[in-house]
Interface confidence: low
């Protein structure tokens, strides 16, 4: 003989995969104080409970350890706690109170649990800016994870030199010492919920500040193709009267400030061009000598020089033979 009672609250609850949900249940007010029994949560259509406080009763293998009956008859509590929710927990459940000694039991109304795909993603936080050669602590956190669930497994993926720092149930710290070549590369934090077999990840692009490592000069002579100088050069022969375009480029992040100087400049020298481009429309005696491109950056500067050697056209020289 069964007596029915209504579960308070909603008829259905939603939980995301891997997370937790509490199915509320209050024992019927008509329950006699002397009623002694065990509580069982069942899946609709199943005869093996998913959770119980009956020590002699087996529970479903797949829910064992994840589904818990929060049993407190004094407070009339018969709620069901579900952790590490899995897609396959998607079902209707009901609570049954059975007495070993009395002829009748109590059966609750049904409540549906809907398990949805996990939409939350980990957060990656970076304190300030990442600077080449300087260690920084990155934190991957999953603040939406419930404490009672199986702790997630954190995995980090990065090409940069790293070491693992401390971790909690909800976060993991990675110490990264980036190099210039790590700028714009991907760093991924992957979080796996072993209880539900769900993995989520977030990927960010590293923004690494670094001083210029390479500076180069491209030389355009008239309409001819450019050629590139990657190191200081003693002399570059050019014809008198020829148009010359010198283009300087450098790496570095944020981009270095490029400027051109004639000669080998002192630190406070005045540039002849405040960009990476130096136009020499007609090379003459004034242009013979050294030109320096300087790449200035808050984290360090770099410069490269080339020396122009002017070839004179025979008919162009006064007193020419």
């Amino acid at each position: 003989q069964e007596r029915r009672f209504q579960l308070e609250g909603p008829e259905s609850l939603t939980v995301q995969e891997g997370l937790c949900v509490l199915v509320p249940c209050r024992l019927p007010t008509t329950l006699p104080a002397s009623y002694y029994g065990y509580g069982y949560w069942f899946l609709e259509g199943a005869d093996v409970p998913v959770a119980t406080n009956d020590p002699d009763e087996e529970v479903q293998e797949e829910t064992r350890g994840r589904f818990h009956l929060l049993w407190d008859p004094r407070r009339k509590n018969c709620s069901l706690s579900i952790r590490d929710a899995r897609r396959r927990d998607n079902a209707a459940y009901f609570f049954r109170l059975k007495s070993k000694w009395m002829k009748y039991g109590y059966t609750s109304s049904k409540l549906s649990v809907r398990v949805m795909a996990l939409t939350h993603r980990p957060n990656i936080s970076i304190p300030g800016t990442l600077e080449s050669g300087h260690p920084s602590n990155l934190t991957c956190s999953v603040p939406w994870v419930c404490e009672q669930g199986t702790p997630p497994i954190f995995s980090w993926m990065s090409a940069a030199p790293t070491s693992l720092g401390p971790r909690t149930t909800q976060s993991s710290v990675l110490t990264i010492t980036p190099r210039p070549q790590d700028h714009s590369t991907n760093l991924t934090c992957q979080v796996t919920f072993p209880g539900a077999g769900v993995t989520m990840e977030r990927t960010i692009q590293l923004n690494v500040s670094y001083a210029p490592q390479k500076v180069a000069i491209s030389i355009f002579q008239g309409n001819s193709a450019a050629f590139k100088i990657l190191q200081n050069t003693s002399s570059l022969p050019v014809l008198e009267g020829q148009a010359l375009r010198l283009l300087c480029d450098a790496d570095g992040n944020p981009p270095a400030h490029l400027s051109w100087f004639q000669g080998f400049p002192a630190l406070n020298a005045t540039p002849i061009s405040n960009t990476g481009v130096l136009e020499l429309p007609q090379v003459g005696s004034a242009e013979e000598g050294d030109f320096t491109c300087r790449a200035q950056h808050p984290l360090g500067s770099l410069q490269i020089s080339l020396s122009l050697f002017v070839h004179w056209k025979p008919e162009g020289r006064a007193g020419g033979v």
Epitope: L43, E44, G45, A46, E61, T63, R88, N90, A91, A92
Partner: antibody, heavy 122, light 106 residues
Framework: EVQLQQSGTVLARPGASVKMSCKTS????????MHWVKQRPGQGLEWIGT????????TYNQKFKGKAKLTAVTSASTAYMEVSSLTNEDSAVYYC???????????????WGQGTSVTVSS | QIVLSQSPAILSASPGEKVTMTCRAS?????IHWYQQKPGSSPKPWIY???NLASGVPARFSGSGSGTSYSLTISRVEAEDAATYYC?????????FGAGTKLELK
Amino acid sequence: EVQLQQSGTVLARPGASVKMSCKTSGYTFTSYWMHWVKQRPGQGLEWIGTIYPGNSDSTYNQKFKGKAKLTAVTSASTAYMEVSSLTNEDSAVYYCSREGTVVANYYGLDYWGQGTSVTVSS
Amino acid sequence: QIVLSQSPAILSASPGEKVTMTCRASSSVSYIHWYQQKPGSSPKPWIYATSNLASGVPARFSGSGSGTSYSLTISRVEAEDAATYYCQQWSSKPPTFGAGTKLELK
């Protein structure tokens, strides 16, 4: 008595699609996962995917994603599978099968349809 | 995915003989199910959750195993047992079946 009645033999051309049905009776259709299994002539069993008619939640074997589509009409207690872009490799018997319990798969696939035979030929 | 390897592929036995077929998993599984299939028929649930006989299955059948190694044993084979037996797991997605062991009677 639980019964799963599948639609009849199908002969189809390459490139076509077929939709087969699995009509159920004798139990609460919306409370159990329905699985589909493929068996090529003289071969073993291959799991295609499963659908929970209670909310149409479905999950597929990666191999059959885009090839098979599972649906369910609760008012008719009937599950459907559509197989598209047919090739000779799709010639097989397709079974629908009920899973014994929703949560644990503890009882395995406890009821099976009689199978729908699909032959792909030009 | 977890691969289930069944051996032997073909098992030939005389009536009254004891036979054992095995199912090995490429990774540990919590339990497996066994199905019996006869030519022209659907598979039937035979043993569920490693060792529990499905409804109507004769008591001469038994199942055992754990981890990666499972087996189905028939204590005294009868003519009606001639069939192909498939093992199946669902400890990880996708569920997979073994290739089957065909039991023939001499």
